[in-house]
């Protein structure tokens, strides 16, 4: 009779993580008598996956009934596959012996590869805010996927970005892989409502890519522009001066009025108005009693925005003549809108 052969018909098997892998094995003869064992690996360090005779193999089931006398199908199923299960599996026939069974013949092996989905991409921006016209970096990371082939794209408000670098790690063979990408984005004044999106496409996602997003509102700082104007006389000897703080973001802003360099009033932007682009406007009023001053008054509106160095705009109030409407513009950037009277 022809000597027993162990046939593993599948050179390789590809299974999605979480699914069941079927590893096929048949013997060509019932002789010699002895059990089949499945191993991962072929050397002395090989791992026992299934032993027909004894042992504990909670994830393994046999395809056919191995207790039947004429059974020659020794295929197994391994449940709940993870990337850590990847490797070469060998079906090995043992010959009954005393005191121990002796390895008789091995199959050629089946390479089990595991398809694993990438984790949801995590996008992170710079630690500190930056102002328009500056270039900032965003990173995107996704882990745990297999096979290695993967596509990553960056978008800003739906427009694809081209200035980015991507690495898939490790370079060689692995159970699973990670992707890391860094994109450069130039900020504009209109970016408060903008989003940066990292999109990952992988064979396991069946054409439905995963996306990670970052809101530029967490990255951008738009400095305010200041304008100080003198309003017509409200009452005898009283002049109303306003400081308009325009187009700033984020809202955190503190305004200080100075009269001839001396602090007159400090307030924090609270009731602001929001512009369409997401920036804020705010206005502060100062009522100045002209009769209390002999000389001309220098009024300064000083704004500290989001912890940055203060910007200011001054206005000279003439005391000698009857006050007329005067104005003075200032350029600086910020956002907010709050109307208050200062008495």
């Amino acid at each position: 009779e022809e000597e027993l052969q162990v046939i593993q018909p599948d050179k390789s098997v590809l299974v999605a993580a979480g699914e069941t892998a079927t590893l096929r094995c048949t013997a060509t003869s019932l002789i010699p008598v002895g059990p089949i064992q499945w191993f991962r690996g072929a050397g002395p360090g090989r791992e026992l996956i299934y032993n027909q005779k004894e042992g504990h193999f909670p994830r393994v089931t046999t395809v056919s009934d191995l207790t039947k006398r004429n059974n020659m199908d020794f295929s197994i199923r391994i449940g709940n596959i993870t990337p850590a299960d990847a490797g070469t599996y060998y079906c090995v026939k043992f010959r009954k012996g005393s005191p121990d069974d002796v390895e008789f013949k091995s199959g050629a092996g089946t390479e089990l590869s595991v398809r694993a989905k990438p984790s949801a991409p995590v996008v992170s921006g710079p630690a500190a805010r930056a102002t328009p016209q500056h270039t900032v970096s965003f990173t995107c990371e996704s882990h745990g996927f297999s096979p290695r082939d993967i596509t990553l794209k960056w978008f800003k408000n739906g427009n694809e970005l081209s200035d980015f670098q991507t690495n898939v790690d490790p370079v060689g063979e692995s159970v699973s892989y990670s992707i890391h990408s860094t994109a450069k984005v130039v900020l504009t004044r209109e970016d408060v409502h903008s989003q940066v999106i990292c999109e990952v496409a992988h064979v396991t996602l069946q054409g439905d890519p995963l996306r990670g997003t970052a809101n530029l509102s967490e990255t951008i700082r738009v400095p305010p522009t200041l304008e100080v104007t003198q309003q017509p006389v409200r009452a005898e000897n009283q002049v109303n001066v306003t400081c308009q703080v325009r187009k700033f973001y984020p809202q955190r802003l503190q305004l200080t009025w100075l009269e001839n360099g001396n602090v007159s009033r400090t307030e924090t932007a609270s009731t602001v108005t929001e512009n369409k682009d997401g920036t804020y406007n705010w206005m502060s009023w100062l009522l100045v009693n002209v009769s209390a001053h002999r000389d001309d008054v220098k009024l300064t509106c000083q704004v500290e925005h989001d912890g940055q160095p203060a910007v200011s705009k001054s206005h000279d109030l003439k005391v000698s003549a009857h006050p007329k409407e005067q104005g003075s513009n200032t350029a600086a950037e910020n956002t907010g809108s709050n109307e208050r009277n200062i008495y």
């Epitope: 002395p44 791992e47 026992l48 042992g55 090995v92 121990d100 390895e103």
Partner: antibody
Amino acid sequence: EVMLVESGGGLVKPGGSLKLTCAASGFIFSNYAMSWVRQTPEKRLEWVATFSSGGSYTYYQDSVKGRFTVSRDNAKNTLYLQMSSLRSEDTAMYYCARSGWDGWFAYWGQGTLVTVSA
Amino acid sequence: DIVMTQSPSSLAMSVGQKVTMSCKSSQSLLNSSNQKNYLAWYQQKPGQSPKLLVYFASTRESGVPDRFIGSGSGTDFTLTISSVQAEDLANYFCQQHCSTLPWTFGGGTKLEIK
């Protein structure tokens, strides 16, 4: 969590014997090949012996063949190394290690020191 | 027996630097049937037992930081630490894990942090 705890080391005279024990937990012991690896005082690592999974196959470094015997008790989750005819060159830290599935050593115990000296 | 040779025997690097160490085998560790290189890398910190970093030359063990990168094929292999950290102070050993016994280790590379 995989745990391997060695014991049984000590000071022994040349020609003497010693039995090392490795108590394993945190995995299905019988499914894995188990090995002994030693580290010499010069910090060189040497594979000593392996007991296979799924069959009573044992493998030895040439220098210890006939003097050392590796055995396992799957019911007790324990690996043993019986050492006899000990030589000064056997002085080392002996580690119990669980093999990966193709010959590397995935987990190591904390080691037990064997000193062979007159 | 397959002889494993590591170089350098020691090196000192500053935190954040890229570290590379070499391991050469006296015969090829590439298995032609599955195209895998049977080489592992271990880290042994002072007073501790060795810890597996990489097997099959480049497959990083679960839980190992991705700054550890194994590469190479045939007889020439490299372990790279892309940005060395203070906690990476250790001895690093390579091992061939072919089916042909005995399994053998390199003499080690001692990494010191400046």
